[in-house]
């Protein structure tokens, strides 16, 4: 049975979703974004350590193998599972535009 | 502009599509499927430098954030970005099942 | 915290002008988008535009292109929205929002009423 | 531009009882979608955006779901305070537009 949301490591180790403060010059959009001028960076960050928040049968074969051969295969990786949408206001050739990303901010995570 | 796949570190050492030969008892799998015995597991394995097969704009966040601040930051990660379906026959109360799973060998990989 | 108040009721006549003002405090004025939205009796909310404090780019509604005009003046933390042509239909609030994030208006003036009769 | 359709144009609710708002968009949105309240001689305040993520200070008895064109908002145990006309908004192109509104009167 999956243990889930229990870090065995300790708690906020494992793998969560952390939100990082960044301005557009961090980000490197400086010469191309105008709006927001900061933004909340929601990402991914942590250890996933065996059964823990398991995206799919590939992280749980992924586990198997990573502990009987750590040099070869590397351990499930703490990514995004969903995103929260963003609205960005970019500097184009004629003036400015109004630009949607659904792929930009994490909004929770899990290992594969 | 994106370097896409060219990998900047040397042939092979970026995140790309390796495959492992398993074992049932490799995977784990040994008490509960009876075929296939052994599976060639393709998994995402590599480093993900700069602008290498980035999966979108998460990822490119994501590498500029761990080229500012590498301790904070993980850079990204080498992940299926698809998969390749596959069938297992399992054991089960009754006797057998045919299973197919949707999520268990990765067919091309990106960096999260 | 962020204040946004804007300049006082105007009485305007069919083809004058009108200019709004709306001054922010509370925060660094180059910090937050201001958009411009407006509200007939007993209407709905209609956007006018959006503009960029830092450098004054700004952005129209096409269905007020060439008769509205932003601009902001940096040095007083204020951005006024002027309206020219005027007619009847143009009686309304109007409201400055200052926006953090492009997509939303989180803080708002207290509205500024422009009637428009002869 | 987007047309928000908003319904219903009125809704009578007893305090304590779960009020559901509606707004349809005339093509797929995604999530950027936000929704106000006004009451009268006020300003419009933020209350979802989103379409479902909260803002600090709302009442978590406010909450929203829907994407692509249908979007809801939910008051799950009405207040006397919570009366007024709610707008939602959408940003997923320019101009923005808001939907005409639904009057939420306190029976």
């Known amino acids: 049975a999956r243990n889930g949301d229990r870090c065995p490591l300790g708690p906020g180790r494992c793998c969560r979703l952390h939100t990082v403060h960044a301005s557009l010059e961090d980000l490197g959009w400086a010469d191309w974004v105008l709006s927001p001028r900061e933004v909340q960076v929601t990402m991914c960050i942590g250890a996933c350590p065996s059964q823990f928040r398991e995206a799919n049968m590939h992280a749980q074969i992924k586990m198997n193998l990573h502990r009987l051969k750590p040099d070869t295969v590397p351990a499930p990786c703490c990514v995004p599972a969903s995103y929260n949408p963003m609205v960005l206001i970019q500097k184009t050739d004629t003036g400015v535009s109004l630009q949607t990303y659904d792929d930009l901010l994490a909004k929770d995570c899990h290992c594969v | 502009a994106r370097n896409g796949d060219r990998c900047p570190l040397g042939p092979g050492r970026c995140c790309r599509l390796h495959t492992v030969h398993a074992s049932l008892e490799d995977l784990g799998w040994a008490d509960w499927v009876l075929s296939p015995r052994e599976v060639q597991v393709t998994m995402c394995i590599g480093a993900c430098p700069s602008q290498f097969r980035e999966a979108n704009m998460h990822a490119q966040i994501k590498m500029n954030l761990h080229r500012l601040k590498p301790d904070t930051v993980p850079a990204p990660c080498c992940v299926p970005a698809s998969y390749n379906p596959m069938v297992l026959i399992q054991k089960t109360d009754t006797g057998v099942s045919l299973q197919t799973y949707d999520d268990l060998l990765a067919k091309d990989c990106h960096c999260v | 915290q962020v204040q946004l108040v804007q300049s006082g009721s105007e009485l305007k006549k069919p083809g004058a002008s009108v200019k709004v003002s709306c001054k922010a405090s509370?925060?660094?004025?180059?910090?937050?988008?201001i958009n411009w939205v407006r509200q007939a009796p007993g209407q709905g909310l209609e956007w006018i535009g959006w503009?960029?404090?830092?450098?004054?780019?700004?952005k129209y509604n096409e269905k007020f292109k060439g008769r509205a005009t932003l601009t902001v003046d940096t040095s007083a933390s204020t951005a006024y929205m002027e309206l020219s042509s005027l007619r009847s239909e143009d009686t309304a609030v109007y409201y400055c929002?200052?926006?953090?994030?492009?997509?939303?208006?989180?803080?708002w003036g207290q509205g500024t009423t422009v009637t428009v009769s002869s | 531009e987007i047309v928000l359709t908003q319904s219903p144009a009125t809704l009578s609710v007893s305090p304590g009882e779960r009020a559901t708002l509606s707004c349809r968009a005339s093509q797929s949105i995604s999530y950027y979608l936000h929704w106000y309240q006004q009451k009268p001689g006020q300003a419009p305040r933020l209350l979802i955006k989103y379409a479902s993520q909260s803002i600090s200070g709302v009442p978590d008895r406010f909450s929203g779901s829907g994407s692509g064109t249908d979007f809801t908002l939910k008051i799950s145990r009405v207040e006397a305070e919570d009366f007024g006309v709610y707008y939602c908004?959408?940003?997923?192109?320019?101009?923005?537009?808001f939907g005409g509104g639904t009057k939420v009167e306190i029976k």
């Open positions: 509370g925060y660094t004025f180059t910090s937050y988008d």
């Open positions: 929002a200052g926006t953090y994030d492009p997509a939303y208006f989180d803080y």
């Open positions: 908004q959408q940003s997923n192109s320019w101009p923005y537009t």
């Open positions: 503009i960029y404090p830092r450098d004054g780019i700004s």
